[in-house]
């Protein structure tokens, strides 16, 4: 198993608009972030 | 709509093998990380695996208890994930199924008895 | 591995009542960045999971803001302020931020 904080947190997951770096790789390859446009169902944290 | 679709479940005897498949529609896939979970008959949630999208080299991971038995894997062009599960065994007898952790599939029944 | 210890097991709630599910890490879910990566689902019966709370305490959308998450790095809470009748099923709570993922082991909501 890799190392799961190796450069990014596993568990910074999906919310558009919050990507800033590697911790953020899960939102860069959500469904949710996949979608573009539309309706996205979870709204980025305030 | 986000669609995840899983299918290939059945009843087998331990020893087997079995292969999942979850097509999906609805986004666009090649670069989406999806996962495995499985629910047990005691109603147990347990991350089997994940894989990750093309430019992350379509990496794998697992969970320690299954590895080296379960192996993930997609094909691009299907826009499908796979769950290849051998020598299964009769605790490998769950609900499985595919899930962005965001959208999740309606899930595929294993059963695993001899 | 990081364990999730929920509690309770079960819950009878009278429609109207509030309801309240803890859940305790043995980790700190804390990420770098200062994110806490704690997650409830909720399955309903003969249903799929469904997120509820993402990050400790965001509403996911199209989730009633009956419900709402806190808590801190290792202590978490679910609370259901007015419990209906769709809220019953097996509630659970989860974190992504270390391999392997993990899944408390479930809280399931009945009604009185």
């Known amino acids: 198993l890799a190392d799961p904080l190796d450069h990014r947190d596993a568990g910074d997951l999906w919310f558009p608009g919050e990507s800033e770096s590697f911790e953020d790789a899960h939102v860069e390859h959500s469904i949710s972030r996949s979608l573009l446009e539309g309706e996205i169902p979870f709204p980025p944290t305030s | 709509e986000v669609q995840l679709v899983e299918t290939g479940g059945s009843l087998v005897q331990p020893g087997r093998s079995l292969k999942l498949t979850c097509a999906t529609s609805?986004?666009?896939?090649?670069?989406?990380?999806l996962h495995w979970i499985r629910r047990s008959p005691e109603n147990q949630l347990e991350w089997v695996g994940q894989i990750k999208g093309k430019s992350d080299n379509y990496a794998t991971y697992y969970a320690e208890s299954l590895q080296g038995r379960f192996t993930i894997s997609r094909d691009d062009s299907e826009r499908s994930i796979y769950l290849q599960m051998n020598n299964l065994k009769e605790e490998d007898t769950a609900i499985y199924y595919c899930?962005?952790?965001?959208?999740w599939g309606q899930g595929v029944m294993v059963t695993v008895s001899s | 591995d990081t364990v999730l210890t929920q509690g309770p097991l079960s819950v009878s709630v009278t429609p109207g009542e509030s309801a309240s599910i803890s859940c305790r890490s043995s980790?700190?879910?804390?990420?770098?960045?200062?994110?806490?990566?704690l997650y409830w689902y909720l399955q309903k019966p003969g249903k799929s999971p469904q997120l509820l709370i993402y990050r400790m305490s965001n509403l996911a959308s199209g989730v009633p803001d009956r419900f709402s998450g806190g808590g801190s790095e290792t202590d978490f809470t679910l609370k259901i302020s007015k419990v209906e009748t769709e809220d019953v099923g097996v509630y659970y709570c989860a974190q992504f931020l270390q391999y392997p993922y993990t899944f408390g082991a479930g809280t399931k909501l009945e009604l009185k």
């Open positions: 980790k700190s879910l804390l990420s770098s960045k200062g994110i806490t990566s």
């Open positions: 899930t962005g952790l965001d959208y």
């Open positions: 609805g986004f666009t896939f090649t670069n989406v990380w």
